[in-house]
Structure formats: structure tokens, C-alpha cells
């Protein structure tokens, strides 16, 4: 008789999840030799231990602490790039500007990027059929709690000038409900962070509006200013040219506004 299984609203665990996490860990420690001390089998064991045999709506940050400890990593605190709803461009940027880091350029972010996972209460099985959806089921699910935990730690580590890339094509350029708006903004440390600089990325080729005057950007400025952190904003009118100029800053066309 097949055992009854809870049906959640979200997609199930990414196929070959254990193998993917382990392989990514090994690859990361090769690409980043300063992390060669990391034992990837222990990392996987700690990752698994955070959600296996636990109710997938009852996960806490505490569950992830063993993994956080094993994945402890130092990134230059003044070279942090946050992003909201524009992940691909942020990652393209740090692939060129190699001394800057998004969360997904760290070991823990790299391990989990684009993956889904959850377990079941009282069984050691991984649920490949469905996992809780943040809105429809519960917010304390394994994936959401993981990203909340690592995002908080990443923001807490930031110092000096912190950059954030925002999507100017969205109705809410700054969204209070995004991970950036709900977690990272509130965990920047005013005693360490001097300025948050927003880069608003334009979508349309003929879009010459100053999106730094957008009401949601003004809202972000207000939140940041109340936290005693300075705020600045730049329009990136041509993201393609922006990336090209990061690659080749000597190019004569790169002196004009991008």
C-alpha cells in the first residue's frame, strides 16, 4: 500500500539534488583555492541534516547553523554586490569584475543557486514530488529559510560602500517583499556600511527616464537613511554597454554615460 504523502503547491526537490550539491562543492573549492580546506562530504551531511526528517513547514535558521559554520567564508566586505530581480546581469558583472561578489559567488550561495529541496517529517526521504510554496503553503520551508539565513549573514558582513543592482523594468523597482527588501536592507550594519549605492538597470533601449526618482527608490532611500546609511543611485541606461565597459574600461566610448 503506497504511503500517504503530503502534496505541496511548489515543485519538488531538484532531481539528483545530493549529487548536484556535492559536485558543486567540489567544483567551487577547485575554482576558489582559498576554500580548499572545506570537506565537501561534511558540507553535504550538514546540508542534509538541516531538512531531512523535519517537517518542511517548520524549518528554522538554527537548523542551518552546522552548514553555516562549515561554509564560513571571508569575502572582502567592501566588494559586495546585492541584487533584486536581476540575478543574471549581477552574475555576469561579477564574472567580469572578479574582485566583487554576489551571494551566489560564495560557497553556500553557489551550492543552492536555482535548486529546490525539502524532506518529510519522520522519514529520511527527500521529497522529489512537491515542496512547500512560500505563499501558498508556508514561509518556513527549507529553501526560504536557507536564503533568508545566508542573505542575512551576507548583508551583515558588508562594509563601506555596498552596491545593489535593481531591475528598472519591474513595476516595483524596489520591492519591500523581496529578499533584498525584507532581509538584506535591514541587516546592513550602520556602524560598518557608509553608503548603499543602487544601480537601476534600464530595460528599453530608448528609455531615458531617471528611474532614480521612482517612488519605490525614494522609499528605499528613506528606509536606508533612517538606518543612518547614506544612499546614492545611478541609472544604467545601457546594460550591454555597461558590461562591455567593465570588460574594457579603456574603450573611448566608455567615458560617456551608460
Amino acid at each position: 500500500v503506497p504511503r500517504w504523502r503530503q502534496q505541496w503547491s511548489g515543485p519538488g526537490t531538484t532531481k539528483r539534488f545530493p549529487e548536484t550539491v556535492l559536485a558543486r562543492c567540489v567544483k567551487y573549492t577547485e575554482i576558489h583555492p582559498e576554500m580548499r580546506h572545506v570537506d565537501c562530504q561534511s558540507v553535504w551531511d550538514a546540508f542534509k541534516g538541516a531538512f531531512i526528517s523535519k517537517h518542511p513547514c517548520n524549518i528554522t535558521e538554527e537548523d542551518y547553523q552546522p552548514l553555516m559554520k562549515l561554509g564560513t567564508q571571508t569575502v572582502p566586505c567592501n566588494k559586495i554586490l546585492l541584487w533584486s530581480r536581476i540575478k543574471d546581469l549581477a552574475h555576469q558583472f561579477t564574472q567580469v569584475q572578479r574582485d566583487m561578489f554576489t551571494l551566489e559567488d560564495t560557497l553556500l550561495g553557489y551550492l543552492a543557486d536555482d535548486l529546490t529541496w525539502c524532506g518529510e517529517f519522520n522519514t529520511s526521504k527527500i521529497n522529489y514530488q512537491s515542496c512547500p510554496d512560500w505563499r501558498k503553503d508556508c514561509s518556513n520551508n527549507p529553501v526560504s529559510v536557507f536564503w533568508k539565513t545566508v542573505s542575512r549573514r551576507f548583508a551583515e558582513a558588508a562594509c563601506d560602500v555596498v552596491h545593489v543592482m535593481l531591475n528598472g523594468s519591474r513595476s516595483k523597482i524596489f520591492d519591500k517583499n523581496s529578499t533584498f527588501g525584507s532581509v538584506e536592507v535591514h541587516n546592513l550594519q550602520p556602524e560598518k556600511v557608509q553608503t548603499l549605492e543602487a544601480w537601476v538597470i534600464h530595460g528599453g533601449r530608448e528609455d531615458s527616464r531617471d528611474l532614480c526618482q521612482d517612488p519605490t527608490i525614494k522609499e528605499l532611500e528613506s528606509i536606508i537613511s533612517k538606518r543612518n546609511i547614506q544612499f546614492s543611485c545611478k541609472n544604467i541606461y545601457r546594460p550591454d554597454k555597461f558590461l562591455q565597459c567593465v570588460k574594457n574600461p579603456e574603450d573611448s566610448s566608455c567615458t560617456s554615460e551608460i
Partner: antibody, heavy 112, light 113 residues
């Protein structure tokens, strides 16, 4: 760990040094190359990872090539100059330092 | 590029005395503690003494100790013995994607009287 291949070469003549390891597997460790000119200090050239990804000092890029087989790690000096005269060391890179196990070194002399 | 500056370049000590060697990095080493010390005697390869700023490598006498953080590090030899006459090198580690992975200091020669 033992280096070999060091000899007298004329400027511009490519030279390959070989590092052989015994008692451990090269697939389990990063391996580093370091050199020391006569009477001078240690200079890190580069290393090769477990899966053969290479990293070089900024000054060494283009001047050296590191490669490996299952039994040895090679350092190719692409176009030696007299400034490349040095003892070349191969070292096993451990988790937290540039090397916990070093070979005795092999001397390369570049002279016309 | 990052630079590790060792001082002094040469130091003389009596048997039983104390030697202090400083190493200053032009930027913080990885994790503020990824700094090692090597001993090299004439005609020999370097030997790892200390890793991660203060951890003693296997078989190294406890008279060797390391301290520091970030950009400033110190190697101390307490109760110097004649066998300690050698050159000493600090070695820092940095994030490879944006800098040289490893950098050595210029060395300090220790002479034991």
C-alpha cells in the same frame, strides 16, 4: 616529492621541469611551484589544482605553464631568460599553507 | 599586486635569547589569518613552521610561535638555539580570483651567536 629536469639552457630554449610524488596521490592535492634565485628569497610561480585548474602569479603568467599527469606535475619555462636562473621547488599544498612537503629543488641555469 | 614586507632583513641573537620577526601585508590576507612561516637552511628546501597565523606544523618545537591578524603578523622564537640559524619567510594567501594566491615575504636571516 622530487624535482628533475634542471640544467643549463640558452636563452629562449623552452625547458620542462618535472615533479614526481610518492606516498600520496596527485589527484588529492594541489601542487605548487616556487623558485629561488641564487642568494635571493622565495618566489611563488603558480599551482595546479586536483582537477588540473592552474593559477599563476601575475608576473609569471605567459612565462610558465603548469600541467599534470596522474604521476607527475610539470613546469614549462616557455622562453627562459637569464633572470630565470634559479632553484625550482615543487611543493605539496596543504589545506592552510603554500606547502607542507617540499622537494629538494632542481637548478636551472640560463646562459648564452 | 600584494606585497609582504618582512622586518628586519637580518637579526642576530644569543643562544637562549628571543627573536621577533615581523611581516606586514599590503592588504589583509584571506580570512585575516591565512599566513604561514617557513624556515630555510642553506642548501635545503623550505620547511613549514607555522600555518594559519599561529598553528604549529607537525614536529615543530614549541619555542616557535606566531601571532597577528589581517595585515600584521609576528614570528617569535623564544629560547633561541644554534639550530635555529636559518632564513625565515612569511607567506600570505589571498583570494585567487582577484589577486595572486600566494605571496612570500622577502625573508629574514637569523644569525645565532
Amino acid at each position: 616529492v622530487e624535482e628533475s629536469g634542471g640544467r643549463l639552457v640558452t636563452p629562449g630554449t623552452p625547458l620542462t621541469l618535472t615533479c614526481t610524488a610518492s606516498g600520496f596521490s596527485l589527484s588529492s592535492y594541489y601542487m605548487s611551484w616556487v623558485r629561488q634565485a641564487p642568494g635571493k628569497g622565495l618566489e611563488w610561480i603558480g599551482f595546479i589544482s586536483k582537477t588540473a585548474i592552474t593559477y599563476y602569479a601575475s608576473w609569471a603568467r605567459g612565462r610558465f605553464t603548469i600541467s599534470k599527469t596522474s604521476t607527475a606535475v610539470d613546469l614549462k619555462i616557455t622562453s627562459p631568460t637569464t633572470e630565470d636562473t634559479a632553484t625550482y621547488f615543487c611543493a605539496r599544498v596543504d589545506a592552510y599553507s603554500a606547502g607542507d612537503l617540499w622537494g629538494p629543488g632542481t637548478l636551472v641555469t640560463v646562459s648564452s | 599586486a600584494q606585497v609582504l614586507t618582512q622586518t628586519p632583513s637580518s637579526v642576530s641573537a644569543a643562544v637562549g635569547g628571543t627573536v621577533t620577526i615581523n611581516c606586514q601585508a599590503s592588504q589583509s590576507v584571506y580570512s585575516d589569518n591565512r599566513l604561514s612561516w617557513f624556515q630555510q637552511k642553506s642548501g635545503q628546501p623550505p620547511k613549514l613552521l607555522i600555518y594559519s597565523t599561529s598553528s604549529l606544523a607537525s614536529g615543530v618545537p614549541s619555542r616557535f610561535s606566531g601571532s597577528g591578524s589581517g595585515t600584521q603578523f609576528t614570528l617569535t622564537i623564544s629560547g633561541v638555539q644554534s639550530d635555529d640559524a636559518a632564513s625565515y619567510y612569511c607567506q600570505g594567501e589571498f583570494i585567487c580570483t582577484s589577486a595572486d594566491c600566494f605571496v612570500f615575504g622577502g625573508g629574514t636571516e637569523v644569525v645565532v651567536k
